[in-house]
């Protein structure tokens, strides 16, 4: 079940996911001056079974100016399966990292993709928040949000995070901005 809304917006903060639940969709967005190829899928989809999850479809961008002489900047269809396998294998090369069951990892980049990715999340997805550069975090609780189903409707829990300018007085004296912990998760996730 897709979440009806985007995760909550927190002023001066961004959110990220560690992994993506099956059913998540990623828009195939291209940078300025490029567009999705006509035969290309508009999105990638996280699919899988009990033992393995992966992204279906591939995003491909081509120059907006190109006409009949369009040069594909990603593999031709017959090459895609082999290339995709290689790309996915290349993502797994860090040792001691176990994939979450029922989740896809971050899809590899594609040529000329837009800088910011647009995901459509499903119920059960968790995203994590941090303040942007130049702002510090004031916490009342975990800086995360979970998409939940309540009475047949989806909603995101409210992350307990306020981001304040570094020169502004703290509302919660003694609180420091948490640095990400060694495994890459925000402190609120690892210290509960």
């Amino acid at each position: 079940e897709l979440c009806d809304d985007d995760p909550p917006k927190i002023t001066h903060a961004t959110f990220k996911a560690v992994a993506y639940k099956e059913g998540t969709m990623l828009n195939c967005e291209c940078k300025r001056g490029f567009r999705r190829i006509k035969s290309g899928s508009p999105y990638m989809l996280c699919t899988g079974n009990s033992s393995h999850s992966s992204w279906d479809n591939q995003c491909q961008c081509t120059s907006s100016a190109a006409r009949n002489t369009t040069k594909q900047v990603t593999p031709q269809p017959e090459e895609q399966k082999e290339r995709k396998t290689t790309e996915m294998q290349s993502q797994m090369q860090l040792a001691d990292q176990v994939s979450l069951p029922g989740h896809c990892r971050e899809p590899p980049p594609w040529e000329n993709e837009a800088t910011e990715r647009i995901y459509h999340f499903v119920v059960g997805q968790t995203v994590y928040y941090q303040c942007v550069q130049g702002y510090r975090a004031l916490h009342r609780g975990p800086a995360e949000s979970v998409c939940k189903m309540t009475h047949g409707k989806t909603r995101w829990t409210q992350p307990q995070l306020i981001c304040t300018g570094e020169t502004e007085p703290s509302q919660f004296p003694g609180e420091e901005e948490p640095q990400a912990s060694p495994d890459g998760l925000p402190e609120s996730e690892t210290s509960r």
Partner: nanobody, 125 residues
Framework: QVQLQESGGGLVQAGDSLRLSCAAS????????MGWFRQAPGKEREFVAT????????YYADSVRGRFTISKDNAKDTLFLQMNSLRPDDTGVYYC??????????????????WGQGTQVTVSS
């Protein structure tokens, strides 16, 4: 302010290994994707490898896949590039780069907002 300082470059023989490091400061290193790029003499800067904010996922240029390994230590604010089976065409200045706030990967130069000064790697045959 944001600072990225590469180290570990040098002159090696073909087939040797090198490990580059990039010490980061002035930003929340654990929250950002990072990348390595290189520039050979007379050529444009090109993508080498990138890693997501968590350090879980990596991606490589075809020319280095299977020989180079990117990693990041979020506890020590340091990015690494382990380079094995070096070849003469790996010669160049290697730069580490910080991904923009909302970028998932440091894959293209557009994805990055801060760069180190670079470290020279020379591979002789």
């Amino acid at each position: 302010q944001v600072q990225l300082q590469e180290s570990g470059g040098g002159l090696v023989q073909a087939g040797d290994s090198l490990r580059l490091s990039c010490a980061a400061s002035g930003f929340n290193f654990g929250w950002h994707a990072m990348g390595w790029f290189r520039q050979a003499p007379g050529k444009e800067r090109e993508f080498v490898a990138t890693i997501t904010w968590t350090g879980r996922d990596t991606y490589y240029a075809d020319s280095v896949r299977g020989r180079f390994t990117i990693s990041k230590d979020n506890a020590k604010d340091t990015l690494f590039l382990q380079m094995n089976s070096l070849r003469p065409d790996d010669t160049g200045v290697y730069y580490c780069a910080k991904a923009r706030e909302r970028a998932t990967w440091a894959y293209s130069e557009d994805d990055c907002d801060y760069w180190g000064q670079g470290t020279q790697v020379t591979v002789s045959s």
